[in-house]
Amino acid sequence: MGGKQRDKDDEAYGKPVKYDPSFRGPIKNRSCTDVICCVLFLLFILGYIVVGIVAWLYGDPRQVLYPRNSTGAYCGMGENKDKPYLLYFNIFSCILSTNIISVAENGLQCPTPQVCVSSCPEDPWTVGKNQFSQTVGEVFYTKNRNFCLPGVPWNMMVITSLQQELCPSFLLPSAPALGRCFPWTNVTLPELPGITNDTTIAQGISGLIDSLNARDISVKIFEDFAHSWYWILVALGVALLLSLLFILLLRLVAGPLVLVLILGVLGVLAYGIYYCWEEYRVLRDKGASISQLGFTTNLSAYQSVQETWLAALIVLAVLEAILLLVLIFLRQRIRIAIALLKEASKAVGQMMSTMFYPLVTFVLLLICIAYWAMTALYLATSGQPQYVLWASNISSPGCEKVSINTSCNPMDQPVNSSCPGLMCVFQGYSSKGLVQRSLFNLQIYGVLGLFWTLNWVLALGQCVLAGAFASFYWAFHKPQDIPTFPLISAFIRTLRYHTGSLAFGALILTLVQIARVILEYIDHKLRGVQNPVARCIMCCFKCCLWCLEKFIKFLNRNAYIMIAIYGKNFCVSAKNAFTLLMRNIVRVVVLDKVTDLLLFFGKLLVVGGVGVLSFFFFSGRIQGLGRDFKSPHLNYYWLPIMTSIMGAYVIASGFFSVFGMCVDTLFLCFLEDLERNDGSLDRPYYMSKSLLKILGKKNEAPPDNKKRKK
């Protein structure tokens, strides 16, 4: 590509940055940016707080704090004054049916009878086979097991009381938490006599039997976590150290590592080509053609025709060719990318505090989510409680004629019913009154608030890190010229001057994300519709919005870097970042892909390392460890392994997101440096010697011939 042509291309994306003798890295003298958006954001937050207060005032905090029995009466109040705890007949059915939406709408309701009790059961117990024919009085009341629903006759047969779900068929040693009786973590469920694997115990404990054969999985999970939490923390510590080590060692091994990874990808593609060729050759010799197959929606059928493998072969060959050409013609750009990665590793090493900034982001995100969840929960519990008819198993004989979900009076339980276990249970809250009528709008406001605040917190993190890393790049003498507290000063600077700009960027992203959520909701509602045109249009819309979100995230990220450096408003920063990147589009693509490859490998290394270590440790395959390092005895050894792996992934993602931000910031600074400076005494380059060497440039030596120390 000729120089003139390049100049023309560059002109299309604005003029290169002019030299500014006063520029010394992140501008000190700034003014507030995007003030209107800042005011709008602060007003919105104020509104969000008002919504929270309204939710708190109109919501029923007792619904969250106090448990309710099956009739909707509060435990520990009124008629249940001496019975403060709620006992679930089959708590496992709660685990199987609880999700964030049901909790937000109904509180902690479960599809199992619930009764207020004066104390939680202390011993494990199950109705014995020989007790089914006894009386409720003999089995429950005389044994101080006062856990039946109120009003169950003393001389009622136990079996019929269980079938009607008037009494619990088993009890677990429980401790009160949140006013509810929750099983102890190390409890072993007693055997359920007289129950074979092919018959289920009545609806009250069907979930229990199905999932476990008389010993529920969740109890075992609690046990396992109780035994292995310490070692999971150790595994997460290893993940933390591995992530740090990988980033810090990049300055030494980035070059060879990138080369090995690229060759690895080439090798994988080459093997893919070979495999596709072999499959194609075999099927061609057999004469297995697509014309014989005809049209089919069974995708696996396409594996047995030669055209499939030929197409795959062509695609892989094209990718291989592209990668080889990139390797040959863009090796200079790859070398720049490697040098920038090394530089980023140095930057992180100089400012180790940046590695732990994700913790701040995490805490802020947690606050945003918790505030939204509480507000949503309290909004959902505003209004009068409503009750509906409900049965645990509506397919039982006698339940056909019952109108499930019709409203009822909880004080008048439906005893005159042919449907076993039919009850009048709490469903939700009515929508009478101004707050209740505006409930949907307030919840929408809350969701908007959630997305906007989350995106703002993430934007804050990006801008703060960009400010810190930019101060590293633009320090002429490293580390002497780096500010004392780069992260803290960047944080204060960002909050003080650029809240509005971050809010602007976050709002744009929020609107796209909300549009995507609405689209997903519509798609979910249209799942049943088999109209291929509608499905296709929906798919296109979703794809476009996904791409738009990706682009906006990319643009925002670079805009925040520019804001951190120059302190201009969002639009100017976004434009400058975009034009700067477009003037260097090939470098952008190469760096982006090389960084992606490297960070993917880093995550793989951390997660894989922790995974392998966890596997060998928790499965007891590591022999000869001391008594202090003995692996715990577990029901499911894969549980702590999976927890360790997921934790390691979160930790690695946190660290590498900082590193990624560092690379992006240094890259933008590097491009600015190239355009702003020329290596003369007046305008020296700020980049490292290795980058200068790769570009074939150098800084003029000062008259006294003393080389500047980098």
Epitope: N130, P153, N155, M156, T199, A202, S417
Partner: antibody, heavy 125, light 107 residues
Framework: QVQLVESGGGVVQPGRSLRLSCAAS????????MHWVRQAPGKGLEWVAV????????YYADSVKGRFTISRDNSKNTLYLQMNSLRAEDTAVYYC??????????????????WGQGTTVTVSS | DIQMTQSPSSLSASVGDRVTITCRAS??????LAWFQQKPGKAPKSLIY???SLHSGVPSKFSGSGSGTEFTLTISSLQPEDFATYYC?????????FGPGTKVDIK
């Protein structure tokens, strides 16, 4: 097929004792609960007692409590009703009946299904 | 103890008639109610359990309904062999108890 045959009925003086037996065949006796039901001449049915499959749980009508004892011998497939301190009002046809609940079927409780032909007890001085 | 009452105590009907017998319990017995048929000089025969489920071999002209405290037995089309006394029985609360019976005779 399932069959229940009562025996041991007869004429007895008030205050005396009598033991009724019910021989079962055609099913696994030890798995089922068994009842005694009586019917006074020209009157309706009256439930007397029940014994569950393993003999551990027994329940009686208030009118016979303390005087009658229900028992079973699973090895002989036989149900018994030991009647002490008999009264004139105990005069009736005594039926044994099988309870459909076997102790294994938790899911539903059906009550009585199969009845014997009955044995007559007459309490008279 | 639970008292069971039946109405009517007796009824006269013709062959082909639809007959309904009502049984009431003094307290809630859910659907733990059985119906028995007894002919003079014979042992009772089980017809219905669980208020509405037919024992095997019982013709479908017999049907039961109700729950809680009020129950009915219906014979959709009365046949000569159906003239007998019908008893209801609760079997959930000890002592189990029978209703006084309803005698169905030929009009």
């Amino acid at each position: 097929q399932v069959q229940l045959v009562e025996s041991g009925g007869g004429v007895v003086q008030p205050g005396r004792s009598l033991r009724l037996s019910c021989a079962a065949s055609g099913f696994t006796f030890s798995s089922y609960g068994m009842h005694w039901v009586r019917q006074a001449p020209g009157k309706g049915l009256e439930w007397v007692a029940v014994i569950w499959y393993d003999g551990s749980n027994k329940y009686y009508a208030d009118s016979v409590k303390g005087r009658f004892t229900i028992s079973r011998d699973n090895s002989k497939n036989t149900l018994y009703l030991q009647m002490n301190s008999l009264r004139a009002e105990d005069t009736a046809v005594y039926y044994c009946a099988r309870d459909r609940y076997s102790g294994y079927d938790y899911y539903y409780y059906y009550g009585m299904d199969v009845w014997g032909q009955g044995t007559t007890v007459t309490v008279s001085s | 103890d639970i008292q069971m009452t039946q109405s009517p105590s007796s009824l006269s009907a013709s062959v082909g008639d639809r007959v309904t017998i009502t049984c009431r319990a003094s307290q809630v017995i859910y659907n733990y109610l059985a119906w028995f048929q007894q002919k003079p000089g014979k042992a009772p025969k089980s017809l219905i359990y669980g208020a509405s489920s037919l024992h095997s071999g019982v013709p479908s002209k017999f049907s039961g309904s109700g729950s809680g405290t009020e129950f009915t037995l219906t014979i959709s089309s009365l046949q000569p062999e159906d003239f007998a006394t019908y008893y209801c029985q609760q079997y959930t609360i000890y002592p189990f108890s029978f209703g006084p019976g309803t005698k169905v005779d030929i009009k």
